[in-house]
């Protein structure tokens, strides 16, 4: 090899790099050395390139032509085929033609950002150049033709289209199976249709932030089964529904901050089982409902700062067993910390909770129950006045506690806090000064002498009358009463909550009077009126009484709205035969749902019940008695009962039975002159009619024959020989006839035979 060629006159050299940037060049330097691998021609005044200038550059791989005045993709002559990276950003290129790129057989990186390109046609990027990274950001692209990038399907890994004017993406716009990063942020996209991104099998990062997306159609991200990160910040989304997330099975991070999302739908997350980080900051959320994120069992970081969350239902975080970081800064969840317990249940792995700037005035004893593993708690930016005894005690792993408040009420109830903080070495991030009493104003709680933490008065309101659990009939008026006392003359405000949410248009009556026992103490009463109650009024009611020193929360009183039961089905009288099945119907409505109970003849211990022949079918309001017996006959009562009262309806069960003998009719032998009785004791329903026969004929009665009124007993007196014969008892009712027979034998009158034996 000959001696190394010198550096070009207008340039500087370092290794195999030639830097001709920022020299005001209008044309290529003529003496480019052949050893050049990297050529920097940026920040010049080049409006066109002479391909001949690149004839003798066999090692050229990297060309920087950014910040010039080129209007088209230049040809680099013979060097085109081995250039790997071509930087053309910040020129005046208006379009890209496939013919301009055909010669770049080795091109892997092409930067066309910050030019004047207005459209991308499917002729722009031909098959050939193995481009891996294509940057078209900061152009004026409004149209993306279907298949515009198909020519790059075998090579393209990163595509940047940010800061353009794209308003719409065609369905299946990209057939780029190797693409891992797609950047579409800062465009004008309004809608993502289903299957828009199908064909991007390898995509890992999709950036759609700062568009105007208001709707994600079902299946919007279908096909992105390898995607890890989705950016949708700064759009106009109002909700995240389940269908739109369908197919995002590998998603790790979802960025949705700075939208207008007002509600989290529980079912929205079932397709994102691997989600680790969910960012919903700067939205319009006002509440977190129970189990609204329960599907996200792998979620590690949840950011909900800068919303308007004022209500966190108990169990709102249920299912988030892997969550480590929960950011709730700048919301309005004071009530959750001041009163509720259980809001954070389910967060077994949480190590960091931030609640900065939530207007929290006090910390309730059980506010953080369920967060025993917490290591970092930020309560800064809250004008905290009081912390209930032992509020943080169960957090054995707490390493950092942030409190910054100059509003502390330094009374006997706060005395525990300074030693506890110091004992746990948590005072480093606690700036806590007293506002009251006046003698301690401005003093750090850590410097206040123990004897100064005294309760000479009760500035914060104290509940003296709690609202009481009550039951009301639909349509009635009811009222809840709540009273509190305070030694402060600070203005008092009243609020009522139903199921932990403030009632905005509550019908309230408030008044104040001086407490009789102590002229210094004011008693404040608030009455909540509920007019013509409906089922919608049911719930747990609580009053919140607030003054400058804090809020006091009453017990929660339950209102149950009742409706007296009324029958929708009543039992009817029935008549049936024995051994068959009796069926009685009974159903009732009411609120709460009434319970149905059955009785027979006023009691619950009856044959069908005892013998397990009674069956109640709760789903179809039917009462059955199987294998009906005569004893089952009677009056059955159906009683429908709820907390409002009870009603009853009766039905008579009549049991029909074919006639039968209770006692068998036996043959008899009597002597002349004696009296004989034949009993035909029959049962049956209706009671059978009994007729006596002698032989085949109805019995002829004489003065010697006597029948009881029901014909069940036949008495024959002074029996004569002619009375002998076959007697038949015939028992008949509407169900049938039964017969029984008795052979009557008559012996001669009693006397002595010649042989000495007795007759009769």
């Amino acid at each position: 090899a000959g001696p190394r060629a010198p550096c070009a006159a207008a340039c500087t050299c370092a290794g195999d790099s030639l830097d001709c940037g920022g020299r005001g060049l209008a044309a290529l330097p003529g003496d480019l050395p052949s050893w050049t691998r990297s050529l920097n021609l940026s920040y010049n005044k080049l409006s066109e390139i002479d391909p001949a200038g690149f004839e003798d550059l066999p090692n050229l791989q990297e060309v920087y032509l950014n910040n010039n005045e080129l209007t088209a993709v230049p040809s680099l002559g013979a060097a085109s085929s081995h250039v790997v990276s071509l930087f053309l950003q910040h020129n005046k290129i208006r379009s890209v033609e496939g013919s301009q790129l055909k010669a770049y057989l080795s091109l892997e990186v092409l930067d066309l950002s910050l030019n004047n390109i207005t459209e991308v046609r499917n002729t722009c990027f031909p098959h050939g150049p193995p481009i891996k990274e294509l940057n078209l950001a900061g152009n004026r692209i409004g149209t993306l033709e279907l298949g515009a990038f198909d020519g790059l399907s075998r090579s393209l890994l990163t595509l940047r289209l940010s800061k353009n004017r794209i308003t719409q993406l065609p369905v299946r716009a990209f057939k780029l199976p190797r693409l891992t990063q797609l950047d579409l942020n800062r465009n004008r996209i309004r809608l993502i249709e289903g299957l828009t991104f199908q064909g991007l099998n390898s995509l890992e990062v999709l950036k759609l932030q700062r568009n105007n997306i208001s709707k994600l159609t079902d299946g919007a991200f279908w096909g992105l089964s390898k995607m890890h990160v989705l950016h949708l910040e700064y759009n106009s989304l109002v909700e995240v529904n389940s269908g739109s997330l369908y197919g995002l099975t590998a998603l790790h991070q979802l960025h949705l901050s700075n939208n207008s999302i007002a509600r989290i739908h529980r079912k929205g997350w079932s397709f994102c089982q691997k989600l680790h980080e969910l960012v919903l900051s700067f939205n319009n959320l006002t509440r977190l409902d129970e189990e609204s994120l329960a599907e996200l069992s792998s979620l590690s970081v949840l950011r909900l700062s800068h919303n308007s969350i004022s209500h966190i239902a108990e169990g709102a975080f249920k299912g988030l067993r892997s969550l480590r970081v929960l950011d709730l800064d700048h919301n309005e969840i004071s009530g959750t910390i001041e009163d509720t317990s259980g809001a954070f249940s389910g967060l077994d792995s949480l190590s960091k909770l931030t609640l900065f700037g939530n207007k929290i005035k006090s910390v309730a004893k059980r506010a953080f129950s369920g967060l025993e593993g917490l290591e970092h708690l930020n309560l800064g930016g809250n004008a905290i006045r009081s912390v209930q005894f032992d509020a943080f005690v169960k957090m054995k792993n707490l390493k950092e506690l942030h409190i910054s408040s100059d509003s502390f009420l330094c009374d006997c109830q706060l005395k525990w806090l300074p030693p506890w903080l110091i004992g746990r070495m948590l005072q480093a991030f606690v700036t806590a000064t007293c506002a009251h009493p006046e003698s301690l104003k401005g003093q750090s709680i850590f410097s206040v002498p123990p004897e100064s933490f005294v309760c000479d008065d009760f500035l914060k309101p104290q509940i003296i009358t709690q609202p009481e659990t009550t039951m009301a009939m639909v349509g009635k008026d009811i009222r809840f009463t709540c009273s509190a006392a305070s030694s402060s003359s600070s203005p008092m405000t009243f609020a009522w909550k139903k199921d932990n949410e403030v009632l905005t248009n509550a019908d309230m009556e408030n008044f104040v009077h001086v407490h009789a026992q102590d002229g210094e103490v004011m008693e404040y009463t608030t009455i909540l009126h509920l007019r013509q109650v409906t089922f919608g009024h049911e719930g747990r009611y609580q009053c919140v009484i607030t003054n400058h020193f804090g809020s006091t929360y009453s017990h929660k009183a339950r209102l149950t709205v009742n409706v007296l039961p009324s029958f929708t089905k009543t039992p009817h009288d029935i008549t049936i035969r024995t051994t068959t099945m009796a069926r009685l119907e009974c159903a009732a409505t009411g609120h709460p749902n009434p319970q149905i109970a059955w009785q027979k003849d006023g009691g619950t211990d009856f044959p069908a019940a005892r013998e397990r022949r009674m069956h109640v079918m709760p789903d179809d309001d039917v009462f059955f008695i199987t294998d009906v017996k005569i004893d089952d006959a009677g009056v059955y009562s159906c009683t429908a009962q709820n907390s409002a009262g009870s009603i009853s309806a009766n039905a008579t069960l009549t049991v029909l039975e074919t006639p039968s003998l209770v006692v068998p009719l036996e043959d008899r032998v009597v002597s002349v002159g004696e009296t004989v009785a034949l009993q035909c004791k029959a049962t049956g329903n209706p009671p059978p009619r009994i007729t006596w026969f002698k032989g085949d004929r109805p019995l002829s009665l004489t003065e010697r024959h006597h029948l009881t009124p029901d014909n069940q007993l036949l008495v024959v007196q002074n029996v004569v020989a002619e009375d002998a014969g076959r007697y038949t008892c015939e028992m008949s009712n509407t169900l049938g006839t039964e017969r029984a027979h008795s052979q009557l034998s008559v012996l001669p009158a009693a006397g002595c035979r010649k042989d000495g034996t007795t007759v009769g």
């Epitope: 005395k415 300074p418 030693p419 110091i422 004992g423 003698s439 104003k441 401005g442 003093q443 750090s444 850590f446 410097s447 002498p449 123990p450 004897e451």
Partner: antibody
Framework: QVQLVQSGAEVKKPGASVKVSCKAS????????LHWVRQAPGQRLEWMGW????????KYNQKFQGRVTITADKSASTAYMELSSLRSEDTAVYFC??????????WGQGTLVTVSS | DIQMTQSPSSVSASIGDRVTITCRAS??????LSWYQQKPGKAPKLLIY???ILHSGVPSRFSGSGSGTDYTLTISSLQPEDFATYFC?????????FGGGTKVEIK
Amino acid sequence: QVQLVQSGAEVKKPGASVKVSCKASGYTFTSYYLHWVRQAPGQRLEWMGWIYPGNVNTKYNQKFQGRVTITADKSASTAYMELSSLRSEDTAVYFCAREELGGFAYWGQGTLVTVSS
Amino acid sequence: DIQMTQSPSSVSASIGDRVTITCRASQDISNYLSWYQQKPGKAPKLLIYYTSILHSGVPSRFSGSGSGTDYTLTISSLQPEDFATYFCQQGNTLPRTFGGGTKVEIK
């Protein structure tokens, strides 16, 4: 670091007054309570009173009420304890101390006051 | 005033010994109990405050326990520099009051 430096030893006659100073450094003088404690020979330590320099509130042990006055000069970060109507049993080492959770975390080196005719 | 009764008034021990000093208050002092070490001609040095919190720079062989009216200072393994007089003091009410002291001497 926190330091409390007291004035030197004093010898006084019965009936006279003594004023002992305590200069604080290494912390915000107006944010902490300063106490005065004395130790007479062979006696247990005896608390005399405190001052909160931030608002110059004071509290005294009733035993010394009327004889002791504690003051502070915020600009000089210095507290003073003046004991009047001295008697021989007031002979003791007088300490200033800064409190933390009811305990005296930082002490001055002590000032011996001898009352003798 | 709350009376503080310290016992024993003196104890003789050897290096490495475990030493326990007790302090009883005449009424509940809500854990506001401090322990001091004092050497002749010096100001007392805070060892423990609020019953069991070790003041910065104090060796971990010193520990405190107790509640209500009864409190204990324990030196787990006596070192040569630990021979001194130890005082307890209640900080719950005014006036602050001190125990009579326990002198720990070399056996």
